[in-house]
Interface confidence: low
Amino acid sequence: MRWCLLLIWAQGLRQAPLASGMMTGTIETTGNISAEKGGSIILQCHLSSTTAQVTQVNWEQQDQLLAICNADLGWHISPSFKDRVAPGPGLGLTLQSLTVNDTGEYFCIYHTYPDGTYTGRIFLEVLESSVAEHGARFQIPLLGAMAATLVVICTAVIVVVALTRKKKALRIHSVEGDLRRKSAGQEEWSPSAPSPPGSCVQAEAAPAGLCGEQRGEDCAELHDYFNVLSYRSLGNCSFFTETG
């Protein structure tokens, strides 16, 4: 099962043909952000303007791995950061118990097929409590834009639902529509609740033969934080054919 499929769908991505042209995608990030010492912060990136399929998202700080969200294997949080890093919401990452040492550059690295690798940069400044209150001015409007978009969508949905109910009180809602809404990643992943199918889940002990032992070594590439230049799929088995 593709645990991250829901989140990939939420990016509005679909499988693109093998013969791809120029890389057209862009990564929007939360940009320069500031947060209070001891507090939490959500790192978010959003890949847009491409039909490429996201196969994996890495979160890195300098050359240090924080976490991986793999479309097949789910979440892997680096042991060094397990106590202070939580997966989600979505393909994002939550940093907790911030210290001044957490100040610095963070990178979201989207591995896609057939485009290749997209990298987004976020600069986090961890401030003393009194200073952090003024730090909001550094926020790039992405989160605000996302929130605004959600508000608009919710409003539109409410209006449409209201009108629909008015016109057809006994109308049966489309199952496809409900599923589509769910699979568009409207629900946040919660560590305390079971993951919805298709979301990135914590893969603490991902079995080595996850893709089926009968496929033998052809399945052996179901891993890792490669920079993907090419990717192929065979049944339920995903192949990361490097690189980077």
Epitope: M23, N58, E60, D63, Q64, L65, L73, H76, S78, P79, S80, F107, I109, D115, G116, T117, Y118, T119, A206, P207, A208, L210, E217, C219, A220, E221, L222, H223, D224, Y225, F226, N227, L229, S230, T241, E242, T243, G244
Partner: antibody, heavy 119, light 111 residues
């Protein structure tokens, strides 16, 4: 200090198998892919394959598929490479190395294990 | 497979001068603004040592006299000023596609 400690030189007979180990220390073993490289005498380097210690999955250079088998033991932070059906062509120095995170560059290397296949 | 051709196969450079080593790939190893070409130094009896990763990033602990440049298919390693301890064989390696391959090596001799 980050270290990759490999087993000493091996002298084996043609047709036999050998298991080379690479003990990692000084870093989080499961965070970094381990790669293996062959260097024949006086020649360049060849990538054999790599294994992800966390997920346990490996990938091979097609040239070495069937010749090399890569495994890891997370509890002892050790990577292993088994070479089978050995011939004189397999005589070489074999290195394990740690793959960087942001790209497949190899930032720390073992000292190398010299394998001699001779009757 | 991507073939990496290094040139020259060997060169002799006077102490304090510049050494330039070229590596040409049979296919582009660059994407999304990154070039997946790396450089190593190897001395006899020792394992290779990473000098430069992703074309131009200096590995920590490596002297600043080493620098890398290039994108697409053409890459260069520069050493300036050359020092006695730089006598070694230098290899380029790509990770632009599987299998990862190395160049044939360039042997640097100090005059």
């Amino acid at each position: 200090e980050i270290q990759l400690q490999q087993t000493g030189p091996e002298l084996v007979k043609p047709g036999a198998s050998v298991n080379i180990s690479c003990k990692a220390s000084g870093y989080s073993f499961t965070d970094y892919i381990m790669i293996w490289v062959k260097q024949s005498h006086g020649k360049s380097l060849e990538w054999i394959g790599n294994i992800h210690p966390y997920f346990g999955n490996s990938h091979y250079n097609l040239k070495f598929k069937g010749k090399a088998t890569l495994t890891v033991d997370k509890s002892s932070t050790t990577a292993y490479m088994q070479l089978n059906s050995l011939t004189s062509e397999d005589s070489a120095v074999y290195y394990c190395a740690r793959r960087g995170i942001t790209s497949a560059h190899f930032d720390y290397w073992g000292q190398g294990t010299t394998l001699t296949v001779s009757s | 497979d991507i073939v990496l051709t290094q040139s020259p196969a060997s060169l002799a450079v006077s102490l304090g001068q510049r050494a330039t080593i070229s590596c040409r790939a049979s296919k582009s190893v660059s994407t999304s603004g990154y070039s997946y070409m790396h450089w190593y130094q190897q001395k006899p009896g020792q394992p290779p040592k990473l000098l430069i990763y992703r074309a131009s990033n200096l590995e920590s602990g490596v002297p600043a006299r080493f620098s890398g440049s290039g994108s697409g298919t053409d890459f260069t390693l520069n050493i300036h000023p050359v020092e006695e301890e730089d006598a070694a064989t230098y290899y380029c390696q790509h990770s632009g596609d599987l299998p990862w391959t190395f160049g044939g090596g360039t042997k640097l001799e100090i005059k």
